[in-house]
């Protein structure tokens, strides 16, 4: 079988949801010594980077200027060491937001509920769209989808304190083109004393994989680079939204 290098890891810097006309940055984390990185969009070559000197960095950043619906979609990357190419990375879905209109998000029975109550979010957008998306702050990869003509509902079932947090919704014109975000709705879930102390809370930190972790080579890194990279690929689970 034809020998290939381990696949790189592709990430969006800061977020995979990019407002239209803003610049997106994608990172391709490959290997020290890679002489070329290629970014592919929907299966076609998009951009090329040849780091100099190649042995000093384990990846590159690609920019995508002036984000619009033509540049929203599935990206992947590959890299080359000498004449040997890597496997293709997982696919990264890049979404353009702030298209057209702004939906309205509401919650029933209200933003302050007790643990165990059933809660439903409603997202409304009067312009032509059939798919709606609900995201929780700090959990932007965990997108819930719902369908409706001008409004969609997101039944949460009986909630726990783990549901606490800030929510926004989007209308979607296709899988990769979303509306402006709604104003956030903060859900406050109170529980009894014993439950609250044991209940997992949901801190609103940014998604850990929406960060570019490129490093410059020092000391032992050179010897460990390939092993480390293989281990990262083994443990890295790419989340499709």
């Amino acid at each position: 079988p034809k020998q290939t290098l381990p696949k790189p890891i592709i990430r969006a810097e800061s977020t995979y949801m990019v407002p239209k006309e803003k610049q997106a940055t994608l990172c391709c984390q490959g290997s020290y010594g890679a002489v070329e990185y290629q970014l592919h969009f929907e299966g076609s070559l998009f951009a090329v980077e040849r780091p100099k000197p190649p042995e000093r960095i384990n990846g590159v950043k690609f920019h995508i200027p002036d984000m619009n619906s033509r540049k929203a979609g599935r990206y992947s990357c590959i890299y080359r060491v000498g004449e040997l190419w890597s496997e293709r990375s997982d696919l990264l879905d890049l979404v353009v937001t702030e298209m057209y209109d702004t939906p309205t998000l509401s919650v029933h029975p209200g933003p302050e509920v007790t643990s165990g109550e059933k809660v439903t979010f409603y997202c409304r957008l009067d312009t032509a769209t059939s798919m709606f998306l609900l995201l929780k702050e700090g959990r932007s990869r965990d997108v819930q989808r719902s369908y409706g003509k001008v409004q969609a509902e997101f039944p949460m079932g009986p909630v726990t304190t783990a549901h606490r947090g800030s929510y926004r919704c989007f209308g979607s014109y296709n899988n990769y083109a979303w509306s402006f975000p709604s104003e956030p709705v903060k859900l406050l879930v109170t529980g009894d004393i014993e439950n609250t102390s044991l209940a997992p809370t949901d801190p609103t930190f940014p998604d850990s994989w929406d960060t570019c972790l490129l490093t410059r080579e020092t000391g032992l890194q050179k010897d460990l680079a390939l092993w480390d990279h293989t281990a990262q690929n083994h443990h890295h689970h790419h989340h499709h939204h």
Partner: nanobody, 127 residues
Framework: QVQLVESGGGLVQPGGSLRLACAAS????????MGWFRQAPGKEREFVAA????????YYADSVKGRFTISRDNAKNTVYLQMNSLKPEDTAVYYC????????????????????WGQGTLVTVSS
């Protein structure tokens, strides 16, 4: 913002040579990666060649590799496309494009990567 103006197009016989130039306005030319694209009648615009902002990285379409050379002179705010061994299938309007990448060594291959475009110059290869 940068304005781009192409020149150097014209009629040339098969096997002949032409040098296209693309002059850019503004003082920040050296911060832009540059590319050449072409569009033949009735066809889609296609990538020809690209050069990084410091000139250290070049990339070519397979169809022109070994015949075309892209270069730049940052002091003159100009990017060039030297076209040798021209063929009838090279007939097209040639466009210059510019974009600001994150590094000195990055180039774009897709038209969507580029932010600014010239109006184009016509190259006709015919006997």
């Amino acid at each position: 913002q940068v304005q781009l103006v192409e020149s150097g197009g014209g009629l040339v016989q098969p096997g002949g040579s032409l040098r296209l130039a693309c002059a850019a306005s503004g003082r920040t030319f050296s911060t832009y990666a540059m590319g050449w694209f072409r569009q033949a009648p009735g066809k889609e615009r296609e990538f020809v060649a690209a050069i990084s902002r410091n000139g250290g990285t070049t990339y070519y379409a397979d169809s022109v590799k070994g015949r075309f050379t892209i270069s730049r002179d940052n002091a003159k705010n100009t990017v060039y496309l030297q076209m040798n061994s021209l063929k009838p299938e090279d007939t097209a309007v040639y466009y210059c494009a510019a974009s600001r990448p994150l590094s000195n060594t990055q180039v774009g291959v897709a038209s969507a990567w580029y932010e600014f475009w010239g109006q184009g110059t016509l190259v006709t290869v015919s006997s």
